[in-house]
């Protein structure tokens, strides 16, 4: 495939990523899946500047990231090493917490209303934003 | 694996500059925070800066501000520090590390100020 | 600036639990990660977010959080682990690293 060089109609670019910010919820399978489905992933924070640049653009809602913890340690879901990583917990967070009675603990994480991260039950009906690298191969074929 | 490696002991006079230098690898050089820090003979560590290399932003502490300059050229994976108008408490040994939490530390470089 | 307050000197017996404390109020917002130093040696990370250890680091090894303290707790303390303790966290901006003063750990 060839190099994306601009980001899609409804992307927003930064830092040679774009970025697609939902305005319905979905729990975090279904919004792993519609990001994979636009040859994207649920974003990955690697720095303070990314941080701020996603929560300036999603404000004070609870909105899924690309971190979960569903087959034990916590996981990017690019493969971006997690113990070496930036990260942005809440106090006292994560706690995969059981007194939700929903079953089971909390495996998925989000950004909260002031920014900072948490892990939450991941069936949860959260808005989410979807990341793509600009430098990356584009799926679809060049255009001749 | 990771590993940092620093370059050599130095001596200068007070009022020099002194650039430090940390060569990473076995790891994507962009993907990790790295950062500066020094410890005085007997003392404890004390952060000198930050420097996210894949943009190249940096946070010095307000200590150093003006006179510590964090740049790194991804092209050879290596950080540089470089400390101005130096004066005898600047003796230490400087170390770089690199992670968020500073996951992995080089071998530290010995800075002597001496007239 | 943020600070954090550790004891400069705690002992324990062969064998026995000991906990190093590090206090400060940057740490009601951002974890403390905690640094083993052996002297003539660099500093190894034993403890980041919460409670979690890098491969390699003992499972004596914990950490907890409680207000404006941080704990590193060592379950069966061993002659290796004679060394300084460092804690750090982040200041309130989040992006400027604070070190506590260090506690140097004997083993008797």
């Known amino acids: 495939g060839s190099e994306r060089t601009c980001c899609p109609v409804n992307w927003v670019e930064h830092e040679r990523s774009c970025y697609w910010f939902s305005r319905s919820g979905k729990a975090w399978a279904d919004a792993d899946n519609y990001c994979r489905l636009e040859d994207a992933h649920l974003v990955v924070v690697t720095s303070w500047e990314e941080q701020k640049f996603v929560q300036h653009h999603i404000g004070p809602v609870n909105t899924w990231m690309g971190l979960h913890d569903q087959n034990g340690p916590w996981k990017w879901v690019d493969g971006t090493d997690y113990e070496t990583g930036f990260k942005n917990w809440r106090p006292e967070q994560p706690d995969d917490w059981y007194g939700h009675g929903l079953g089971g603990g909390e495996d998925c994480a989000h950004f909260t209303d002031d920014g900072r991260w948490n892990d939450d039950v991941c069936q949860r009906p959260y808005r989410w934003v979807c990341e793509t690298e600009l430098d990356k191969a584009s799926q679809e074929p060049p255009l001749l | 694996q990771v590993q940092l490696v620093q370059s050599g002991a130095e001596v200068k006079k007070p009022g020099a500059s002194v650039t430090v230098s940390c060569k990473a690898s076995?790891?994507?050089?962009?993907?990790?925070?790295m950062y500066w820090v020094r410890q005085a003979p007997g003392q404890g560590l004390e952060w000198v800066g930050t420097?996210?290399?894949?943009?190249?932003?940096?946070d010095y502490a307000q200590k150093f501000q003006g006179r510590v300059t964090m740049t790194r050229d991804t092209s050879t994976s290596t950080l540089y520090m470089e400390l101005n108008s130096l004066r005898s408490e600047d003796t230490a040994v400087y170390y770089c590390?690199?992670?968020?939490?500073?996951?992995?530390w080089g071998q530290g470089t010995l800075v002597t100020v001496s007239s | 600036s943020s600070e954090l307050t550790q004891d400069p000197a705690v002992s324990v017996a062969l064998g026995q639990t000991v906990r190093i404390t590090c206090q400060g109020d940057?740490?009601?917002?951002?974890?403390a990660s905690w640094y083993q130093q052996k002297p003539g040696q660099a500093p190894i990370l034993v403890i980041y977010?919460?409670?979690s250890r890098p491969s390699g680091i003992p499972d004596r090894f914990s950490g907890s959080t409680s207000g404006n303290t941080a704990s590193l707790t060592i379950t069966g303390a061993q002659a290796e682990d004679e060394a300084d303790y460092y804690c750090?966290?982040?200041?309130?901006?989040?992006?400027?690293?604070?070190f506590g003063g260090g506690t140097k750990l004997t083993v008797l």
């Open positions: 590390a690199s992670g968020w939490e500073l996951n992995y």
């Open positions: 076995g790891y994507t050089f962009r993907s990790y925070y």
């Open positions: 420097i996210n290399p894949s943009g190249g932003s940096t």
């Open positions: 940057s740490l009601r917002n951002y974890y």
């Open positions: 977010t919460k409670n």
């Open positions: 750090n966290s982040r200041d309130s901006s989040g992006n400027h690293v604070v």
